[in-house]
């Protein structure tokens, strides 16, 4: 299992019908984690997608951040996670917004807020034992 | 070098069916996430299928194409497949597969296979 915070750009960016593979494990004593695809490589990069599973408080937001501001949050329905358990974790990008699908059915449309095309770099952070991330 | 041959299209009435396949061979081809995407003409680039080998395989699929199109993987022969059922006009595309690669590789893409489903 690699080391979180995970970080990898994305040169060539992503654009519809692009998905991103994520797994790992949640920690027995996990708080929350994120993915986020981030618009930049530096500190304070809007994000398209900020993907928060909350094992604290038992719910999982996505929301998006441009220019230092989070925007509405929005929630999905339950909490696919568990501590102590593996996941995977798909995120589909289409031209009208990102599909996380967890497990094997889809979890969430979560509709574009920010151009896709300006999407940079993926991070993975917060309590979990990272195993990797693919794209394709 | 990753290289990925897709077969298995072709002309197809609607309600008909066909199989899809896909092998893929060179170094770093044992992948474990595999999937089928398609592009009709003048169309973005769509997600149909992927299968992911996780504690057992974990299998996804398009909602347009839940029920009718199942994926699989022959790992003997690095192959992955896509069993299309209940084809419609709207499947017409061709049909690319792809193996999952670290970001920054973007994954590994085959050449197309033609679908067309028309009566």
């Known amino acids: 299992m690699s080391n979180v915070p995970h970080k990898s750009s994305l040169p060539e960016g992503i654009r519809p019908g692009t998905v991103l593979r994520i797994r790992g494990l949640v920690p027995p004593n996990a708080s929350r984690f994120h993915v986020n695809l981030l618009c930049g490589e530096e500190q304070g990069s809007d994000a398209a997608l900020h993907f928060n599973p909350r094992l604290d408080t038992s719910e999982v937001v996505f929301n998006s951040k441009e220019q230092g501001s989070w925007g509405r949050e929005e929630r999905g329905p339950g909490v696919p996670f568990q501590r102590g358990q593996p996941f995977e974790v798909l995120i589909i990008a289409s031209d009208d917004g990102f599909k996380a699908v967890v497990g094997d059915a889809q979890y969430h449309h979560f509709r574009h807020r920010l151009p896709l095309a300006r999407v940079r770099l993926v991070e993975v952070g917060g309590d979990v034992q990272l195993d990797s991330v693919r794209i394709f | 070098e990753v290289q990925l041959q897709a077969s298995g299209g072709g002309f197809v009435q609607p309600g008909g069916s066909l199989r899809l396949s896909c092998a893929a061979s060179?170094?770093?081809?044992?992948?474990?996430?595999m999937g089928w995407f398609r592009q009709a003409p003048g169309k973005e680039r769509e997600f149909v299928s992927a299968i992911s080998g996780f504690w057992g395989w974990t299998t996804y699929y398009a909602d347009s194409v839940k029920g009718r199109f199942t994926i699989s993987r022959d790992n003997s022969k690095n192959t992955v497949y896509l069993q299309m059922n209940s084809l419609r006009a709207e499947d017409t595309a061709t049909y690319y597969c792809?193996?999952?690669?670290?970001?920054?590789?973007?994954?590994?893409w085959g050449q197309g296979t033609q679908v067309t489903v028309s009566s």
């Open positions: 060179g170094a770093g081809s044992r992948s474990d996430v």
């Open positions: 792809a193996l999952g690669g670290a970001p920054g590789q973007t994954g590994y």
